[in-house]
């Protein structure tokens, strides 16, 4: 950190490595929960027009696709991978692509992905050719 920039206690707004280099924050689609027409497709665009700077540099991009008897929604947010989201760990946070994985949620079909390249949660991928691991 440059000498004229104050260091503050418990500062999670800045992340530095051992050499003092600074990590830039992620740029993610961030529309929270929106109704979606994405269904039975190998991949979908988020149709979220808001790209936001994540508040903390350690945060990654997340997308959550949910389908129940009434509707389909797609949630796009930033989130810290050290913390669970919707009670699930973000196992794929280092991935450059948002590869959807199904999670068990009663009463709905629930897929979630996370990724760490700019706006990577704009393109959500359901295709089995990308998804090599078993769903939880």
């Amino acid at each position: 950190i440059p000498p004229h920039v104050q260091k503050s206690v418990n500062n999670d707004m800045i992340v530095t490595d051992n050499n003092g280099a600074v990590k830039f924050p992620q740029l993610c689609k961030f529309c929270d929960v929106r109704f979606s027409t994405c269904d039975n497709q190998k991949s979908c665009m988020s149709n979220c027009s808001i790209t936001s700077i994540c508040e903390k540099p350690q945060e990654v991009c997340v997308a959550v696709w949910r389908k129940n008897d009434e509707n389909i929604t797609l949630e796009t947010v930033c989130h810290d991978p050290k913390l669970p989201y919707h009670d699930f760990i973000l196992e794929d946070a280092a991935s450059p692509k948002c590869i959807m994985k199904e999670k068990k949620k009663p009463g709905e079909t629930f897929f979630m992905c996370s990724c760490s390249s700019d706006e990577c949660n704009d393109n959500i991928i359901f295709s089995e050719e990308y998804n090599t691991s078993n769903p939880d």
Epitope: P2, V5, N19, A21, F24
Partner: nanobody, 124 residues
Framework: EVQLLESGGGLVQPGGSLRLSCAAS???????RMWWVRQAPGKGLEWVS?????????YYAKSVGGRFTISRDNSKNTLYLQMNSLRAEDTAVYYC?????????????????WGQGTLVTVSS
């Protein structure tokens, strides 16, 4: 020598406006994503806004979206931040910084060369 020189800060009343400038030299301005970053007294850094080198795509923190506008003039190697509807919580030192698009980390501990910053004080 790489230099970033911020200016335009000052004292403004709540609801007022300011325009910050950052004059860049010593590097190829059109190769870098540029950022405005701020630090309020006694607090950590907050990433305020960014703009792509070409095409002028812009990004904002949720705290300033709709109130602040980032822009750049590549012919003048200058970055701008138009700040409207200013609030007391916008009081901070504002810095500009440069980033190679797609690169996650700065090259060194000097944040790829910070400027000295410009102080914005919002108070009645």
């Amino acid at each position: 020598e790489v230099q970033l020189l911020e200016s335009g800060g000052g004292l403004v009343q709540p609801g007022g406006s300011l325009r910050l400038s950052c004059a860049a030299s010593g590097f190829t301005f059109t190769e870098y994503r540029m950022w405005w970053v701020r630090q309020a007294p006694g607090k950590g850094l907050e990433w305020v806004s960014a703009i792509e080198p070409i095409g002028n795509r812009t990004y904002y923190a949720k705290s300033v979206g709709g109130r602040f506008t980032i822009s750049r003039d590549n012919s003048k190697n200058t970055l701008y931040l138009q700040m409207n509807s200013l609030r007391a919580e916008d009081t901070a030192v504002y810095y500009c910084a440069k980033q190679i698009p797609g690169r996650k980390w700065t090259a060194n501990s000097r944040f790829d060369y910070w400027g000295q910053g410009t102080l914005v004080t919002v108070s009645s």
